[in-house]
């Protein structure tokens, strides 16, 4: 009679994470008598996966009834597969011995590859806000996928970006992989409503890529422009001066009126109007009693936006002139740093 052969008909098996892997194995003879064992890997460090004779292997089930006398099918099923299960599995026939069974013949091995989906991409931007015309970095990370081949793309408002660098780790063989990409994005004054999207395509996703997004509203700071104008007189001795604060984002803004350098009123932007591009406009007014001033008055609208150094604009109110409307004086903007006295 021909010597027993252990046949593993599948050189490789590909299974999606979470599913069940079937590893096929048949023997060509019932002799010699002895159990079958399954191992992952070869050599002294191999890992026992299933022992027909003894042990508890909750994830493993046999395809046929191994207790039947004439059974020669030693195929197994491994449930709830994870990337950690990847490797080469050997079906090994043992000959009954005393005191221990002796390894008789091994199958050629079946390589189990696990297809694992990448995790949802996580996109993160800079630690602090940046102003328009600056280039900032966004990172995208996704983990736990297998096989290693993966495609990552970046988009800003649907337009594909080209300035990015991507790494897949580790470089060598591994049960699963991670991807890390950094894209450079140029901010514009119109980017409050913009989105940066990281798109990951992988064989496990059946053509339906995963996307991670970041809203540029979390990243951008649009500085305001200021305009101080004098309105027509309300009464003989009263002049209305307005400060228009335009095109700013985010909304956090505090405005202070100063008369000849002395604080007159401080207020916080509340009832702002929103522009189409997501930036805000706000207007504050100051009623000045001209008769209370003997000399010309320097009115300053000082704005502190989103914790930045104060920006200001001044208007010279001529007291000597008859109180009629005067043109706006687009004097000073920008007081520099918070620690400085601008007057």
């Amino acid at each position: 009679e021909e010597e027993l052969q252990v046949i593993q008909p599948d050189k490789s098996v590909l299974v999606a994470a979470g599913e069940t892997a079937t590893l096929r194995c048949t023997a060509t003879s019932l002799i010699p008598v002895g159990p079958i064992q399954w191992f992952r890997g070869a050599g002294p460090g191999r890992e026992l996966i299933y022992n027909q004779k003894e042990g508890h292997f909750p994830r493993v089930t046999t395809v046929s009834d191994l207790t039947k006398r004439n059974n020669m099918d030693f195929s197994i099923r491994i449930g709830n597969i994870t990337p950690a299960d990847a490797g080469t599995y050997y079906c090994v026939k043992f000959r009954k011995g005393s005191p221990d069974d002796v390894e008789f013949k091994s199958g050629a091995g079946t390589e189990l590859s696990v297809r694992a989906k990448p995790s949802a991409p996580v996109v993160s931007g800079p630690a602090a806000r940046a102003t328009p015309q600056h280039t900032v970095s966004f990172t995208c990370e996704s983990h736990g996928f297998s096989p290693r081949d993966i495609t990552l793309k970046w988009f800003k408002n649907g337009n594909e970006l080209s300035d990015f660098q991507t790494n897949v780790d580790p470089v060598g063989e591994s049960v699963s992989y991670s991807i890390h990409s950094t894209a450079k994005v140029v901010l514009t004054r119109e980017d409050v409503h913009s989105q940066v999207i990281c798109e990951v395509a992988h064989v496990t996703l059946q053509g339906d890529p995963l996307r991670g997004t970041a809203n540029l509203s979390e990243t951008i700071r649009v500085p305001p422009t200021l305009e101080v104008t004098q309105q027509p007189v309300r009464a003989e001795n009263q002049v209305n001066v307005t400060c228009q604060v335009r095109k700013f984002y985010p909304q956090r803004l505090q405005l202070t009126w100063l008369e000849n350098g002395n604080v007159s009123r401080t207020e916080t932007a509340s009832t702002v109007t929103e522009n189409k591009d997501g930036t805000y406009n706000w207007m504050s007014w100051l009623l000045v009693n001209v008769s209370a001033h003997r000399d010309d008055v320097k009115l300053t609208c000082q704005v502190e936006h989103d914790g930045q150094p104060a920006v200001s604009k001044s208007h010279d109110l001529k007291v000597s002139a008859h109180p009629k409307e005067q043109g706006s004086n687009t004097a000073a903007e920008n007081t520099g740093s918070n620690e400085r006295n601008i007057y």
Partner: antibody, heavy 119, light 107 residues
Framework: QVQLVQSGAEVKKPGASVKVSCKAS????????IHWVRQAPGQGLEWMGD????????ANNQKFKGRVTMTADTSTSTVYMELSSLRSEDTAVYYC????????????WGQGTLVTVSS | DIQMTQSPSSLSASVGDRVTITCKAS??????VAWYQQKPGKAPKLLIY???SLETGVPSRFSGSGSGTDFTFTISSLQPEDIATYYC?????????FGGGTKVEIK
């Protein structure tokens, strides 16, 4: 008080790179941008670019076609400007300056670093 | 890039004279204009920002005005220590650009 202290003069050969440092003190380093401006002998001022140490955001003058790299080390409050592929026309005094983009002009300047490119 | 055309390139005036320098931008820069003074061998010094704001510690004889594309820098009464080169600069759009400079001398 606000101070920007730059590294010393450099002499480089054409094709080489130079890295100029600018150490900031007297203010919150991550709140302000550091800009780089150069001035060739007897010439005017030319803006090269800036970096915001807080956000890592940068803006560059495209004239330099990627030859300028700016980095910031928040642990030492130092900004570095590296200019590569040097040519003789890069001979200039290089200044680092402080500003708040969109809000404020360049209010404090370093003492300048003379970079001479000569074969 | 926004061009800043500064004129004149040089001027000579007497102590006490009123000196005016103009700067024309190639496009609207709102009021993001600064003026700097540079003395030989020294770094530039900020005098005026936001078109008309006087930097802290700068004498009140220096002033600025204008908006949009046309800007003016004035020294109301020229002093011997004002001998320097003056530059305008826009900081509305990158790349930030400077005027060519005006060298001011005493007659």
């Amino acid at each position: 008080q606000v101070q920007l202290v730059q590294s010393g003069a450099e002499v480089k050969k054409p094709g080489a790179s130079v890295k100029v440092s600018c150490k900031a003190s007297g203010y919150t380093f991550t709140d302000y941008e550091i800009h780089w401006v150069r001035q060739a002998p007897g010439q005017g001022l030319e803006w090269m670019g800036d970096i915001h140490p807080g956000s890592g955001g940068t803006a560059n003058n495209q004239k330099f076609k990627g030859r300028v790299t700016m980095t910031a080390d928040t642990s030492t409050s130092t900004v570095y400007m590296e200019l590569s592929s040097l040519r003789s026309e890069d001979t200039a005094v290089y200044y680092c300056t402080r500003a708040v983009s969109g809000y404020y002009a360049m209010d404090y300047w370093g003492q300048g670093t003379l970079v001479t490119v000569s074969s | 890039d926004i061009q800043m055309t500064q004129s004149p390139s040089s001027l000579s005036a007497s102590v006490g004279d009123r000196v005016t320098i103009t700067c024309k931008a190639s496009e609207d820069i709102y009021d993001r204009v600064a003026w700097y003074q540079q003395k030989p061998g020294k770094a530039p010094k900020l005098l005026i920002y936001g078109t008309a704001s006087l930097e802290t510690g700068v004498p009140s004889r220096f002033s600025g005005s204008g908006s949009g594309t046309d800007f003016t820098f004035t020294i109301s009464s020229l002093q011997p220590e004002d001998i320097a080169t003056y530059y305008c600069q826009q900081y509305w759009t990158t790349p930030w650009t400077f005027g060519g400079g005006t060298k001011v001398e005493i007659k």
